[in-house]
């Protein structure tokens, strides 16, 4: 018998609503699916909370190049980190006694395969990205995004699903990975630590960062999720590593300021509309990218993952506000919600730029040891 | 293809009770969090209770003591159980869950609290 932590004090819906709700490979649809309802059919079928504005209001394409005073990957050092003392973990889980295999969590058991046999695929994410072995690839453009400029209305949801917290976009955000390479965003979320303990998914070199925003799209080519899991390319995730910086993030700091209100699992608040491309690095230019998985079950492989080279600065308060304020099931932290990195089983990480090089004085001859499979190649 | 299909709404008096379902067919259920929303005539969606995977519940203050969610991940069934019923509780309820973030709802079921 769990005790809830004070559920009373907290509504459910806040103050004023993925990776996360897994789809096993086996319950892939056929082809004659019927589309999905954005909102649930009303009787007078009022405008939903996420209905978008129509083309015309949007912002033109934001290809973004500027230089900002965040660190970048390669000026990071190449002394391999001290490995994290614990494993990822959500503490303190009190479950239900007789609690079955079926109920994935951060840690412990029950093993991910075993909820999920995907999991235990051989192109699984996340990945140890490191950049002397990564293969520069120059047809790797500068992603472009279009739409994330949103206006204050209609508000957006944001929930705390047990496992993150997560960000419902609207319709209307699209993002090319290349010609041809269309998506739209369904969701953003974020994966973090613990006071001192750093919480990132994707490591560098071994070097894990304080925490990760990842930004989950959906392929042009499919109308619902549920048709494009584990089918390639039908998934696409930006992901850019937070570091601890001097100054308040002002884009962060429209969602951190409200995890207050969905501090239990299963609460959700409405926010408003924000400029969704800031809370992302600004240079869209330096990326790592590779094709794996969903990092949660049912860890559907084919998705393409995007690394920003580049980092986001959050300061010390934010960094400690994201990775203190949200419980999971029962009394326990959501805290430590990354999977552990997962082997590359022969992938090459491709990188837009040439990470390989490194131009200090420490490489005489740098190399670049792997070459380039272009997109379609 | 993920369906939810929502049952059992209908009319009763204030005080009354009322049990609604939502069978669920392609997701693996017991994998999901499920969600009861409603909406009244005029009215914001406004969510009424959660159940987590792992059976932890969560719910709206103004349903709280009243209403029971509860699933059955055998029959891929999601319930809710409605108590002291009033007559500010009629909307159209919906079953709920999410994949990756994207929604998928049921058609929903009238309840309509009446004398």
């Known amino acids: 018998q769990r005790l809830p932590r004070m559920q009373e004090d907290s509504p459910l819906g806040g103050g004023s609503s993925g990776e996360d709700d897994p789809l096993g490979e086996e319950d892939l649809p056929s082809e004659e699916d019927s589309p999905r309802e954005e909102d649930p059919p009303g009787e007078e079928d009022l405008p939903g909370e996420e209905d978008l504005p129509g083309e015309e209001d949007l912002p033109e394409v934001k290809p973004k190049s500027e230089e900002e005073g965040s660190l970048k990957l390669e000026d990071l050092p190449t002394v391999e980190a001290p490995g994290d003392p614990q494993e990822p973990q959500n503490n303190a889980h009190r479950d239900k006694e007789g609690d079955d295999q079926s109920h994935w969590r951060y840690g412990g058991d029950p093993p991910w395969p075993r909820v999920s046999p995907a999991c235990a695929g051989r192109f699984q994410s996340p990945v140890d990205i490191r950049p002397q072995l990564a293969a520069f690839c120059p047809a790797l453009r500068p992603l472009e995004l279009l739409g994330f400029q949103l206006p204050p209305l209609p508000e957006l949801r944001l929930r705390n699903n047990g496992h993150s917290v997560q960000l419902t976009l609207p319709p209307g955000l699209e993002m090319a990975l290349g010609p041809g390479r269309e998506y739209r965003a369904l969701q953003l979320h974020l994966h973090w630590g613990a006071a001192g303990r750093p919480g990132s998914e994707h490591t560098v070199e071994g070097h894990r960062f304080p925490a990760e925003i990842h930004v989950v799209h959906l392929s042009t080519a499919f109308a619902r999720v549920d048709e494009a899991l584990g089918r390639p390319g039908g998934l696409a995730v930006l992901a850019a590593f937070l570091e601890e910086g001097p100054e308040e993030n002002s884009a962060y700091e429209q969602l951190l300021s409200r995890l207050e209100e969905i501090a239990e699992e299963g609460s959700e608040t409405q926010v408003p509309g924000l400029d969704i491309s800031a809370l992302l690095p600004s240079d869209f230019s330096r990326y790592f990218q590779y094709e794996g998985s969903l990092t949660t079950p049912p860890c559907a492989q084919g998705v393409i993952w995007t690394v920003f080279n580049q980092t986001v600065m959050l300061s010390a308060k934010q960094l400690h506000t994201l990775s203190d304020t949200l419980w999971g099931p029962g009394d326990s932290r959501l805290q430590l919600n990354f999977r552990a990195t997962q082997p590359l089983n022969g992938r090459v990480i491709e990188a837009s730029f040439p990470a390989g090089v490194d131009s200090s004085p420490r490489a005489a001859e740098p190399v670049q040891l792997n070459s380039c499979l272009a997109a379609g190649d | 293809q993920v369906q939810l299909v929502e049952s059992g709404g209908g009319l009763v008096k204030p005080g009354g009770s009322l049990r609604l379902s939502c069978a669920a067919s392609?997701?693996?259920?017991?994998?999901?969090?499920m969600r009861w929303y409603r909406r009244a005539p005029g009215k914001q969606r406004e969510l009424v209770a959660y159940?987590?995977?792992?059976?932890?519940?969560n719910y709206a203050d103004s349903v709280k003591g009243r209403f029971t969610i509860s699933r059955d991940n055998a029959k891929n069934s999601l319930y809710l159980q409605m108590n002291s019923l009033r007559a500010e509780d009629t909307a159209v309820y919906y079953c709920n869950t999410d994949l990756v973030g994207e929604d998928y709802w049921g058609r929903g079921t009238l309840v309509t609290v009446s004398s």
């Open positions: 392609g997701i693996t259920f017991n994998l999901h969090a």
């Open positions: 159940i987590s995977a792992r059976d932890w519940t």
